[in-house]
Interface confidence: low
């Protein structure tokens, strides 16, 4: 790359009136070679009588420069711009610990100015992620951490996360948080967060996807409240009462645990047997009263009804006509009825 031309370049060029030192309007920027595509480095300086590139401390051949020159209308100073092309082969042929670099050197009558070093690197992105996310089953509202360390690459890969192929935007959904080291945090897992999550690494060379991590948000079952105790199932004597509950508060979901414990509880109960009422025998007929009737009675006490037993059917009191005893018979008139 050395050329005798550059050995003869003076430190300054005699000129009148004196010029300022060259000032870089544009400095070369770092560049990446993708596959076999060469890169262009470009710089621009004013005032500049000469401008050339130096790469890895060696001058680039004059014929490899594309130079343009013009006069700045406002300042009247000469503006020079230059570009060179760097191939993959050139970068690969460099031996030593340092990366391939180039810098611009511009001259004016006042002296020389060097631009910053622009590094030229071969871009790549390895295929294998250094850490891939781990699928998990998590309970509702639990925090979930999905880790991702992207494959090694130049330039360093950017990372984004996909939820079922859709890009996660933590600004849009505040339940997601992406840490500085590319981990995805689901702050409180929701049922809607049950999905396939993929870490995507990309740079100018390629885009790589991690293996998919399946996150399943499960719900453990919870018991409903107990029903009221049933009535004793025996109408008479020993039996049981029961109450029930169901595993529906909530029902288990996505492989969540079924409720532990009993869904039915029973307790012993004793119901007093009902006793139906029965009549006592009729009493003797009473003596015949003044109204020519006599009566007899009985009571529902042999036994009396108990514990919801049936009452006795029929009359407590019976009366009928009589004509003996104190019965006073009178002739019938329109107001009286004789009882026989």
């Amino acid at each position: 790359q050395d050329d005798d031309f550059f050995h003869e370049l003076p430190e300054t060029f005699p000129s009148d009136p004196p010029e300022p030192l060259p000032h870089f309007l544009i400095e070369p920027e770092e560049a990446y070679i993708v596959k076999n595509k060469p890169v262009n480095l470009y710089c621009k300086a004013s005032p500049a009588t000469q401008i050339y590139f130096k790469c890895n401390s060696e001058w680039v051949h004059q014929k490899d420069h594309i130079v343009d020159e013009r006069v700045d209308e406002t300042s009247g100073l000469i503006v020079r711009e230059v570009s060179i092309e760097i191939s993959r082969q050139q970068v690969e042929e460099l031996f030593g610990p340092e990366d391939y670099w180039c810098q611009c050197v511009a001259w004016s009558s006042a002296g020389t100015t060097k631009s910053r070093k622009a590094y030229v690197r071969i871009a790549y992105l390895r295929k294998t992620f250094e850490q891939e996310p781990l699928g998990k089953e998590v309970s509702l509202e639990q925090e979930v951490l999905l880790q991702c360390r992207p494959p090694e690459g130049i330039p360093v890969a950017e990372v984004e996360w996909l939820k079922n192929e859709d890009i996660i935007d933590p600004v849009e959904d505040r339940n997601f948080y992406i840490t500085i080291d590319h981990n995805l945090i689901i702050k409180q897992a929701r049922l809607s967060d049950t999905a396939n999550y993929t870490c995507v690494a990309k740079n100018i060379v390629a885009k790589r996807k991690s293996t998919t991590a399946t996150v399943i948000v499960y719900v453990n079952g919870g018991w409903s409240t107990w029903t009221e105790w049933s009535v004793c199932n025996s109408r008479c004597g020993r039996g049981y009462q029961k109450r029930t509950r169901t595993c529906t508060n909530p029902a288990p979901l996505n492989g969540g645990a079924f409720c532990e414990g009993q869904s039915v509880q029973k307790i012993a109960c004793t119901t007093l047997c009902p006793v139906d009422g029965r009549w006592t025998p009729w009493s003797k007929w009473s003596t015949c009263g003044t109204e020519c009737t006599h009566w007899r009675r009985r009571e529902c006490t042999a036994p009396a009804p108990k514990n919801g037993g049936k009452d006795c059917d029929g009359l407590v009191l019976q009366s009928k006509n009589c004509t003996d005893g104190l019965c006073m018979q009178t002739a019938p008139d329109s107001d009286d009825v004789a009882l026989y």
Epitope: Q131, E132, L134, G135, K136, E137, V138, S139, Q142, E143, V144, L145, Q147, N196, T211, T212, A213, T214, I216, Y218, N254, G255
Partner: antibody
């Protein structure tokens, strides 16, 4: 009660492929993470990898280039293939169920099967 | 990978003793830690998950504590059936890794 049972040859020749199957009974293969773990004689436990019934796999990077884990939900079993084996792969191989939750504990294990790599 | 370091690697104790096993992670793993018991010729058995939750059917003399990088398994009163090897396991990130084990022997 969930039960896991490993099956496969107890002797494999160097450079060949080790193949094991784990049959799951008493429960569904769905919604869990099914792992293979091995233990060389007199040594500690080493996780090989897992598969979810969705087909998602995750392998130990130290074995990744040689491991394949697959699942057959219709037969309720999952399988391990480890290629290019050497004597260093001699171990008791366990299949285990990862119960999920954030800490992925292995709550059910097979009884283990000893695989010897020898010519 | 996250390294899990258990200590001690073995200990001798008597029935009725209080036994403590520690597990240290090479980086913070929150509460993503499980403990297992393994007896010779048998598969490991889950004792504690999520650092401190007791697995169903495990006696209450087993308890777990800790968060971040330092965790402890405690057996409050050692029983004859507790002589075994105990392992911790992290699931903060893959690859899932186990501690080297602590063998509890009869004094």
């Amino acid at each position: 009660q969930v039960q896991l049972q490993e099956s496969g040859p107890g002797l494999v020749k160097p450079s060949e492929t080790l193949s094991l199957t784990c049959t799951v009974s008493g429960g569904s293969i769905s919604s869990y993470f099914w792992s293979w773990i091995r233990q060389p004689p007199g040594k500690g436990l080493e996780w090989i990898g897992y598969i979810h019934n969705s087909g998602t796999t995750n392998y130990n990077p130290s074995l990744k280039s040689r491991v394949t884990i697959s699942v057959d939900t219709s037969k309720n079993h999952f399988s391990l293939k480890l290629s290019s084996v050497t004597a260093a792969d001699t171990a008791v191989y366990y299949c285990a169920r990862g119960r999920g939750m954030a800490t992925l504990p292995f709550d059910y294990w097979g009884q283990g099967t000893l695989v010897t790599v020898s010519s | 990978d996250i390294q899990m370091t258990q200590s001690p690697s073995s200990l001798s104790a008597s029935v009725g003793d209080r036994v403590t096993i520690t597990c240290r992670a090479s980086q913070s793993i929150s509460s993503y830690l499980n403990w297992y018991q393994q007896k010779p010729g048998k598969a490991p058995k889950l004792l504690i998950y999520a650092a401190s939750s007791l697995q169903s059917g495990v006696p209450s003399r087993f308890s777990g504590s800790g968060s971040g990088t330092d965790f402890t398994l405690t057996i409050s009163s050692l029983q004859p059936e507790d002589f075994a090897t105990y392992y911790c396991q992290q699931s903060y990130s893959t690859p899932l890794t186990f501690g080297g084990g602590t063998k509890v022997e009869i004094k």
